[in-house]
Interface confidence: low
């Protein structure tokens, strides 16, 4: 059940986000989340994950990229990119060449 907290061993992760109480946190896995809100520059947050492991398997989009790893401080030097904005879909009636 992805909603239940992990029962596995904990790892120490780099913590860099508004929620951090210090430079590291402890969790079931480490995370890096790159988020771009409308009209703003992308923000990268580093921290720990305990719930919703399924987010780790999500594909990057133009708005969010969610990275997870499972070893000590493994999120420290990770840099993420967002997917490039998709080009407008071709208009009906064109042959795409």
């Amino acid at each position: 059940d992805p909603v239940k907290p992990s029962r596995g061993p904990l790892v120490t992760c780099t913590c860099e986000s508004p929620h951090c109480k210090g430079p590291t946190c402890r969790g079931a896995w480490c995370t890096v989340v790159l988020v771009r809100e409308e009209g703003r520059h992308p923000q990268e947050h580093r921290g720990c994950g305990n719930l919703h492991r399924e987010l780790c398997r999500g594909r990057p989009t133009e708005f969010v990229n969610h990275y997870c790893c499972d070893s000590h401080l493994c999120n420290h030097n990770v840099s993420l990119v967002l997917e490039a904005t998709q080009p407008p879909s071709e208009q009906p009636g064109t042959d795409g060449q």
């Epitope: 907290p5 029962r7 904990l10 946190c25 969790g27 079931a28 921290g47 720990c48 305990n50």
Partner: nanobody
């Protein structure tokens, strides 16, 4: 937000037994690791025994075969059965829990106030 209440410490003769217990309360979603640490006068705090939510235990070499850690997940309680106590076991014993609070983003460390165990020769 979280309270760890320890009990069971006291004075005991060498070779005797004590049972420590520690109950965690508060806005807790889940506790992962629970354990006991001890600190003798003039020494650093050291791990005595710890146990995961799944029941996997590990012990300091100095207490293996004498101490047994167990826990009740439903009650967020951890126990330390201490047998064949020695004078060198004399210390303040601290309960530790690593858990996730409601509204929390990751696990946090919580500590009890400590309970004194004195083993006389």
């Amino acid at each position: 937000q979280v309270q760890l209440v320890e009990s069971g410490g006291g004075l005991v003769q060498s070779g005797g037994s004590l049972r420590l217990s520690c109950a965690a309360s508060g806005s807790i979603i889940s506790i992962n690791d629970m354990g006991w640490y001890r600190q003798a006068p003039g020494k650093q705090r050291e791990l005595v025994a710890a146990i995961t939510r799944g029941g996997t235990a590990n012990y300091a070499d100095s207490v293996k075969g004498r101490f047994t850690i167990s826990r009740d997940n439903a009650k967020n309680t951890v126990y330390l059965q201490m047998d064949s106590l020695k004078p060198e076991d004399t210390a303040d014993y601290y309960c530790n829990a690593v858990g996730l609070l409601r509204g929390g983003y990751w696990y946090e460390d919580w500590w009890g106030q400590g309970t004194l165990v004195t083993v006389s020769s």
